[in-house]
């Protein structure tokens, strides 16, 4: 009696199942009690000897490529051996690599967690994922795993993490890069500093007083509000960051406490108050202001 090994499918793709069947065309296995064993190269597969003429392999990988055969043993211990069958496991090259961010859109608050998720639409086997920072890439990390996605995490984002990023996936057919993704780090405003600028050391009534408010840190645009004794004088915007100024034509009522507030939508901060006092110097006719 002759024995044949049949693999289905005969040309499997990595990660897919394969069924090996040990066939006896001229003998019904039910006619006699047979034990079956399947081999790859020199190694027995699965449970070893079994009464089933089929062996189910859940997932085939590139390294499972090789020469397969089966043996059948009768109760009388006569062993039949099939011819060897070459099974080539086909690897699918990586394709359509993409990089996504968590949070989506690439905008992240300073101190928050950022995850760069590298995905491939196709690709089998061990895929090596690499993450790069900057258009001229600085390699951040690499991971090799049997999955279509991998993650790189920055647990606490800093201002210096604002850059372009991309990832590369590779499974033996050459590296395939994703497109670029830009990360914007949003920084809440720091406590602003208010400075009062007068045209002379002793400002007089009708002088123009400049209130300059500046938050040294914070993502633009920044909106500055100016206050006199908690009454709003007005607001100024700094579209590109930096400070902003508000001009005031002085009258005697302008004595008192001044402050400003910076707000960039990520939080507001109020400056310390600056006091402006009128003083009447001895022998002087006009009122003067000091701060």
């Amino acid at each position: 009696a002759e024995l044949f090994l049949i693999a289905s499918p005969s040309h499997p793709t990595e990660g897919s199942p394969v069924t090996l069947t040990c066939k006896m065309p001229f003998l019904q296995s039910s006619d006699a009690q047979f034990q079956f064993c399947f081999f790859r190269d020199t190694r027995a597969l699965g449970p070893g000897w079994s009464s089933s003429p089929k062996l189910q392999i859940a997932a085939m990988w590139k390294e499972d490529t090789g020469s397969y055969w089966c043996e059948a043993q009768t109760m009388a211990s006569k062993v039949l051996r099939s011819r060897r069958s070459q099974i080539n496991v086909h690897r699918v090259p990586v394709a359509d690599v993409s990089l996504e961010t968590q949070p989506p859109g690439g905008q992240v608050m300073e101190g928050d967690r950022l995850v760069l998720i590298c995905s491939v639409a196709m690709g089998t086997g061990d895929i090596t994922f690499l993450w790069y920072k900057g258009a001229v890439g600085l390699n951040l990390q690499s991971k090799t795993q049997r999955s279509l996605t991998a993650e790189y995490e920055i647990p606490s984002v800093r201002e210096s993490d604002a850059e372009q990023y991309y990832c590369v996936a590779e499974n033996g057919y050459g590296p395939s890069p994703s497109g670029l993704v830009s990360i914007t780090v949003r920084i809440p405003v720091s406590r602003p500093i208010l400075m009062l600028r007068a045209p002379r050391a002793q400002a007089a009534v009708e002088d123009v007083l400049e209130l300059h408010c500046e938050a040294l840190r914070g993502s633009p645009p920044i909106l500055y509000w100016f206050y006199h004794e908690d009454i709003t004088l007005g607001s100024r915007s700094a579209p590109s960051g930096g400070g902003a100024s508000f001009n005031l034509s002085l009258t005697e009522e302008h004595s008192g406490n001044y402050s400003c507030e910076a707000n960039n939508g990520l939080g507001a901060q109020r400056s310390e108050a600056v006091t402006l006092n009128f003083t009447v110097p001895t022998g002087a006719r006009s009122n003067h202001l000091t701060s």
């Epitope: 001229v136 890439g137 590296p175 670029l180």
Partner: antibody, heavy 119, light 112 residues
Framework: QVQLQQSGPELVKPGASVRISCKAS????????IHWVKQRPGQGLEWIGW????????KYNEKFKGKTTLTADKSSSTAYMQLSSLTSEDSAVYFC????????????WGQGTTLTVSS | DVLMTQTPLSLPVSLGDQASISCRSS???????????LEWYLQKPGQSPKLLIY???NRFSGVPDRFSGSGSGTDFTLKISRVEADDLGVYYC?????????FGGGTKLEIK
Amino acid sequence: QVQLQQSGPELVKPGASVRISCKASGYTFTSYNIHWVKQRPGQGLEWIGWIYPGDGNPKYNEKFKGKTTLTADKSSSTAYMQLSSLTSEDSAVYFCARRIHYYDYFDYWGQGTTLTVSS
Amino acid sequence: DVLMTQTPLSLPVSLGDQASISCRSSQSIVHSNGNTYLEWYLQKPGQSPKLLIYKVSNRFSGVPDRFSGSGSGTDFTLKISRVEADDLGVYYCFQGSHVPWTFGGGTKLEIK
């Protein structure tokens, strides 16, 4: 297929401004940086800078800061280069080019836009 | 700025001959990530430049194996083993390691 189509030749007066366009097709516009290169008549090539169309963020060669403004419009997959306060020194052919990261090279170039500054 | 100096300025050759173009940088163009971003481009009259070699010695797809790049640090060479009529034009080296990125002055390959 990938193409970078630049706007036509420009003849402008000294002191004026001009905007040159570079329309990309055949690929995802926001996935790659677009660079600009200057070539004066009979001379070599000078790198001006790049723009990332994903967020419109430009990076300039210090020499061209103030002279050049790079922008990009995602909706039309078009990159722009504006040149201001033009002088005869700005008369040149300007190229846009796509640069592939990781492999790191300019793989596709526009056909070039000739700018002539003359009164 | 990194100055890229190409020699010779002009290179007259006979078809079938070997041609060699040198490119020297004023400082090392090894990037902090360990790569050397040195490229060679060919520009024919009235055309935009075309990539030949990237990262010193990697031939771009479709570029004949007659073209080869070599070098390290500050000294780089482009060799054309058997010059064909289609190879004529101006060759530029380019460094993309240090901003501002810079091109060499060009070498004109012409028929002797």
